[in-house]
């Protein structure tokens, strides 16, 4: 054999006895008839030698160390060569060592070509016998980053100040390339960064530096995980120890792109996050240890990357191609913001782009899927605009306000479906006619259905909320003067079953001056509760609202107000109420800012209740609640 090392190679080759075996016959290195058991060849030297036995691989090992000095000159970055070529070396178990020394401010990055690396723990070995041992340096102290086999996920390791990489090849292994390159990076300001890339499903077990010994005091180590957006990652700690901290706290930090609370800070004993979609970083931060009894910080953990479970594997088609002026947003339902990590919950478009919020617009067919352990964490909000620009074309036109079935079939709860109904100013008004008569939600008689309609003005400057209405009441229709939004809001998952009860028709009708008119047809023996719009905030200034209350021929209606006085104090104008019998046109007028409210009154025929507000002083608003009860006429009411 001849080993010739160029002067500029900075390589030293050492052939020495390996682990002693119980072989009877000793073996020697023979150089010009001299028998030796160790041979050192430095760069710029050439040595010719032989072995005194047939199977030197059973006796000797060879170490090839290349020193790379990035302190005094430029660093030879790029693909690292196996030098001398393995074909020129004796067939012994060989270890190639690259020792790179650099300034503290220089970041060094080892880049591993495919196959990437898989970290192994103490006592483990690599199936093919090829191992990569990587060390870093903190001042004069060597820090073991880890031992790795082939066929894993580790693609890059970044360090600073220096790196020592040892590649061990068994004597029979044909490998003739190092499989890695070195690049320079800016300072990473930590011990190291390990990048782990998942192409698909899989798992990786990783360990803190020096494992199973202690992680260096007050150091920081980061793992960067690259995970396809359609897969989910979960972290579990297999083994950890905490040291005795004098200052600071040992912790792990997660950085999740898109998270509002980065970094997410965890104790090592906490349950670690699962179900994360896409890339994330995990950092281990040590503390200042107690000098007398430091203890050790160490961590061994597993990252499991897999396809999401159950619902999340399905693809849902949301066909909005025939819709106009509509947008559907799937988003996280609000929760109290906690510093605790909550696994990611994402919605994906075409199974590719996943995010916590997704808005779908009308005019297209969309394919979506979910990456979420618990779909109740998401909800849907839909907005649709129905507008009339030409009053001659729209008059008497009707539209059905119904949630499309495509949306109802999604596994995410519908929160709000809002219809914005727009009319030309002072030209047209609107009438809402429900499929099933509506009940107004009041404290006295709350809605207990799975959904309600929230009706409010859609004029930006006007703060007018007509109220919340649910099926199963006496309100036959609601007429409104101008632009409104009608929001179907769900309150329970059972809405899916009750969806058939939804149904509201809007028609464009000739313009009228009153803000709103409620047509009420009470049912016998049920008490109908009605209240003025903007309950709790007061009817807006100079607003007029009416209730058209039908009384069947054989019934008597009892109209009851729930307070003695309205409580309104007018700054300008007058607030009044008119109760008018429809048949006789007889009316009673009450000054709401002066008079007491009427005692319960009985009406044998349909009647109007009209309430008009003044400009009240602040804090003295107009809020009225009244009820209508029908009883048969035969009963003696005295």
């Amino acid at each position: 054999f001849e080993i010739a090392l160029p002067r500029e190679s900075n390589i030293t080759v050492l052939i020495k006895l390996g682990t002693p075996t119980l072989l009877a016959k000793p073996c020697y290195i023979v150089i010009s008839k001299r028998h030796i058991t160790m041979l050192s060849i430095k760069s710029g030297e050439r040595i010719v030698f032989t072995f005194s036995c047939q199977s030197p691989e059973n006796h000797f090992v060879i170490e090839i160390q290349k020193n790379i000095d990035c302190m005094s000159g430029p660093c030879p970055f790029g693909e690292v060569q196996l030098q001398p070529s393995t074909s020129l070396l004796p067939t012994l178990n060989r270890t190639f060592i690259w020792d790179v020394k650099a300034h503290k401010s220089i970041g060094l990055e080892l880049q591993f070509s495919i196959p990437r690396l898989r970290q192994i723990g103490p006592g483990e070995s690599c199936p093919d016998g090829v191992t990569h041992s990587i060390s870093g340096r903190i001042d004069a102290t060597v820090v073991r980053i880890g031992t790795f086999c082939s066929n894993g996920t580790v693609s890059r390791i970044k360090m600073q100040e220096g790196v020592k990489m040892a590649l061990h090849l068994p004597w029979f292994h044909p490998r003739n390339v190092s499989g890695f390159s070195i690049a320079n990076r800016s300072s990473i300001k930590r011990l190291c960064i390990i990048e782990s890339v998942f192409e698909g499903e899989g798992s990786a077990t990783l360990m803190s530096a020096n494992y199973p010994e202690g992680f260096p005091e007050d150091e920081l180590m980061t793992w960067q995980f690259v995970v396809p957006a359609h897969l989910r990652a979960s972290v579990s700690f297999l083994n950890f120890n905490l040291s005795n901290c004098e200052r600071k706290e040992e912790r792990v930090e997660y950085y999740i792109p898109g998270s509002t609370t980065n970094p997410e800070v965890f104790k090592l004993e906490d349950k670690q996050p699962g179900n994360m979609a896409g890339n994330f970083n995990l950092s281990l931060q040590g503390c200042d240890q107690d000098a007398q009894s430091p203890g050790i910080l160490r961590l061994q953990f597993q990252v499991l990357v897999q396809h999401p479970q159950n619902e999340s594997n399905k693809i849902y088609v949301v066909d909005l191609s025939n819709e106009r002026a509509m947008s559907l947003t799937i988003e996280p339902r609000p929760v109290k913001q906690s510093r605790k990590f909550v696994p990611g919950c994402f919605v994906c478009l075409e199974s590719r782009t996943c995010s916590s919020n997704l808005t779908l617009t009308s005019g297209s067919k969309h394919k979506i899927s979910f990456l979420c352990d618990d779909l109740t964490r998401l909800w849907m909000n839909v907005e649709k605009t129905i507008s009339c620009t030409d009053h001659r074309y729209c008059q008497r036109k009707s539209y059905s306000l119904q949630v499309p079935s495509d949306i109802l079939h999604l596994p995410v709860e519908l929160h709000d479906f809002s219809w914005k109904l727009l009319v030309p100013k002072d030209r047209l008004s609107l009438v809402l006619v429900p499929a099933q008569k509506l009940q107004q939600h009041t404290h006295e008689k709350p809605c207990n259905t799975s959904f309600s309609y929230l009706v409010a003005s859609a004029i930006p400057s006007q703060d007018l909320y007509f109220g919340s209405f649910c099926p199963g009441g006496s309100i036959k229709q609601i007429q409104v003067k101008q632009n409104i939004s009608v929001t179907l809001r769900t309150f329970a998952p059972s809405f899916q079953q009750e969806a058939s009860r939804q149904g509201l028709t809007v028609s464009f009708i000739p313009y009228f001056k009153e803000e709103g008119v409620f047509t009420v047809t009470p049912d016998t023996k049920s008490k109908v509760y009605l209240r003025t719009p903007n309950w709790d905030r007061g009817l807006p200034s100079l607003t007029s609202v009416s209730w058209n209350i039908s009384v069947p021929r054989d019934q008597v209606a009892c109209l009851t107000f729930f307070k003695e006085r309205s409580g309104v104090v007018c700054q300008t104008g007058r607030a009044f109420m008119i109760i008018q019998e429809q048949r006789t046109r007889a009316e009673e007028i009450f000054s709401l800012d002066e008079d007491v409210l009427p005692k319960p009154s009985f009406h044998h025929h349909s009647f109007w209740v009209n309430i008009s507000n003044c400009s009240p002083t602040s804090g003295k608003q107009l809020d009225l609640l009244f009820s209508v009860t029908l009883t048969p006429r035969t009963v003696d009411l005295t």
Epitope: A4, P6, R7, E8, K42, S43, G44, E45, N67, L88
Partner: antibody
């Protein structure tokens, strides 16, 4: 006796490649030695350019690294210099030389040199 | 790159005199293997350079013993004990310890 002879065009146009051949007699280029190219500029300044060793290892002057290539043809016992994208600054006398790399460590044997002018 | 500074630039001597040429380096020329690859060459007019001394002080085969090399730290000296007419020409020092290998600027030995 080891003898080296350089050959190649004496005139090269700027931006073109310069190619020189060194024919070695009296010694096999695969037996030993490092086979160098060295040039001498007008004014006598000498510059080591690079070498190819008997076992195919190459080493180049970093100032030329992106432009230089030293190769060999063992069947003809020749080694070659290729210098790309030449400029008038590459006008020089080019020597090929053999050195007992692992012995003297020096450049022991030199060719007589060939003058190359870079001009349009 | 290692810069080798030779002095003097020109050295006029009489035949039979002793001549001394200096070569100075700012950095050590000791290689990690312990060798110092510092050589001396003579280039006679119209000829290629010829090796005289290698590894600081070892004479190349066929070089007369009036040529000697020595060192003091990073200062290297070539001495010719009795100059003969055939010794005239330009003397170059050369280092092969660190890539790029470099030559000194040369010292011209001429007759007074």
């Amino acid at each position: 006796e080891v003898k080296l002879v350089e050959s190649g065009p004496g005139l090269v146009k700027p931006s073109q490649s310069l190619s020189l051949t060194c024919t070695v007699t009296g010694y096999s280029i695969t037996s030993d030695y490092a086979w160098n190219w060295i040039r001498q500029f007008p004014g006598n300044k000498l510059e080591w350019m690079g070498y190819i060793s008997y076992n195919t290892y190459t080493s180049y002057n970093p100032s030329l690294k992106s432009r230089i290539s030293v190769t060999r043809d063992t069947s003809k016992n020749q080694f070659f210099l290729q210098l790309k994208s030449v400029t008038i600054e590459d006008t020089a006398t080019y020597f090929c030389a053999g050195g007992d790399y692992y012995g003297t460590g020096a450049v022991d044997y030199w060719g007589q040199g060939t003058t190359v002018t870079v001009s349009s | 790159e290692i810069v080798l500074t030779q002095s003097p630039l020109s050295l006029p001597v009489s035949l039979g005199d002793q001549a001394s040429i200096s070569c100075r380096s700012r950095q050590t020329l000791v290689h990690t293997n312990g060798n110092t690859y510092l050589d001396w060459y003579l280039q006679k007019p119209g000829q290629s350079p010829k090796l005289l001394i290698y590894k600081v002080s070892i004479r190349f085969s066929g070089v007369p013993d009036r040529f000697s090399g020595s060192r003091s730290g990073t200062d290297f000296t070539l001495k010719i004990s009795r100059v003969e007419a055939e010794d005239l020409g330009i003397y170059y020092c050369f280092q092969g310890s660190h890539v790029p290998w470099t030559f000194g600027g040369g010292t011209k030995l001429e007759i007074k």
